[in-house]
Interface confidence: low
Amino acid sequence: LPAQVAFTPYAPEPGGTCRLREYYDQTAQMCCSKCPPGQHAKVFCTKTSDTVCDSCEDSTYTQLWNWVPECLSCGSRCSSDQVETQACTREQNRICTCRPGWYCALSKQEGCRLCAQLRKCRPGFGVARPGTETSDVVCKPCAPGTFSNTTSSTDICRPHQICHVVAIPGNASMDAVCTSTSPTRSMAPGAVHLPQPVSTRSQHTQPTPAPSTAPGTSFLLPVGPSPPAEGSTGD
């Protein structure tokens, strides 16, 4: 049928398809209207009446044009290691991202199931590879002539200061101590501090229930620091 005269519901031409934002209802055998984002199908269409849409209830949403009988439940509230970067609305799910200093240890479709704290390199070890949204910090022992005296997820091994006269030689976890004044510092530009990675992974992408009316639950997975590896905290 020409678009100008086809009002839903209508029977499609043999072998034809329904238009954009319409769907074919198998029961009515008609092209019927989809519901817009933020709504769902309260009453399905018949041969003589179109789809009746209704707004999604609190804590539920639909992101696309649809004909679902119930809106999807927004994901659970963000866990303590995450921040909410997108609120639950009738048209979009809540998005949780790992907070600074954390990374997504267990990812899932379009999101993060589990945030974990970035490993901290203990004294004597420095950051070999900084953490990212989805990977932990890698620590390495400080090489001769370098040291790290901090427990940090961002500090790299720094060169010992160069003394005119050395009072105490430096080691992997301690800088050299000079007897003379005005020691010189041998340091590569920008070698001291790596910026904290910014996490942008989302958490619950799936709907999560809401009672009495909507569906249920959430996964606030317990999160702890990674087990100590060589070069991590926990001597």
Epitope: S76, T205, P207, S212, A214, T217
Partner: antibody
């Protein structure tokens, strides 16, 4: 009316695997998390894990990782739990329970009648 | 994991009197001003039944003689006046984080 119907009593040998079911009706199966809870004879309740049938998302109690596997068949509105490498410690009643999320609360509002598992040689 | 400790493990209360059950969490189960703490009743041979959610809310169909209170780590279930049919084991449960954990249960006997 919401109903969760669990499969019947199971007797199994140590080392074997069993798969129990939880058939649901009266609500949209894919919209609610389904949890599984263990109760040993005369003991309290222990949370095993949960599955979201809408996308098969799962979360497990660390204690049951490798022991329990949760699955769901949406076309049958049925959740399943498979337990492997059975020992006497696995003898218990296992409940499936639907969790509801109110805007500011989560709770188990409907429970199956329980499946009794006895592990014995 | 959040450990939920209930006390007493059992108690006997006369018909018409008050039963008080305590539940303590090893860490706060509150979030943004709400308590993620539920109470369930279980009778022998039956699955648990939701009694109270969010510390103090009664689902429809639960008699008003059941009440819950508390926040943070300390919660209380009160039953008053106790009736014969209240003989059961009562469990508290936190839903603030996974793994969900239950208290050890309190067995209530009616004298």
């Amino acid at each position: 009316e919401v109903q969760l119907q669990q499969s019947g009593t199971v007797l199994a040998r140590p080392g074997a695997s069993v798969k129990m079911s939880c058939k649901t009706s009266g609500y949209t199966f894919t919209s609610y998390w389904m949890h599984w809870v263990k109760q040993r004879p005369g003991q309290g309740l222990e949370w095993i894990g949960t599955i979201y049938p809408g996308n098969s998302d799962t979360s497990y109690n660390q204690k049951f990782k490798g022991k329990a596997k949760l699955t769901a068949v949406t076309s049958a509105s049925t959740a399943y739990m498979e337990l492997n490498s059975l020992t006497n410690e696995d003898s218990a009643v296992f409940y499936c329970t639907r969790e509801n999320l109110l805007l500011r609360s989560y709770f188990f509002d409907y429970w199956g009648q329980g499946t009794t598992l006895t592990v014995s040689s | 994991d959040i450990v939920m400790t209930q006390s007493p493990a059992s108690l006997a209360v006369s018909l018409g009197q008050r039963a008080t059950i305590s539940c303590k969490a090893s860490q706060s189960v509150d979030y943004d001003g709400d308590s993620y703490l539920n109470w369930y009743q279980q009778k022998p041979g039956q699955p648990p039944k939701l009694l109270i959610y969010a510390a103090s809310n009664l689902p429809s169909g639960i008699p008003a003689r059941f009440s819950g209170s508390g926040s943070g780590t300390d919660f209380t279930l009160n039953i008053h006046p106790v009736e014969e049919e209240d003989a059961a084991t009562y469990y508290c449960q936190q839903s603030n984080e996974d793994p969900r954990t239950f208290g050890g249960g309190t067995k209530l006997e009616i004298k």
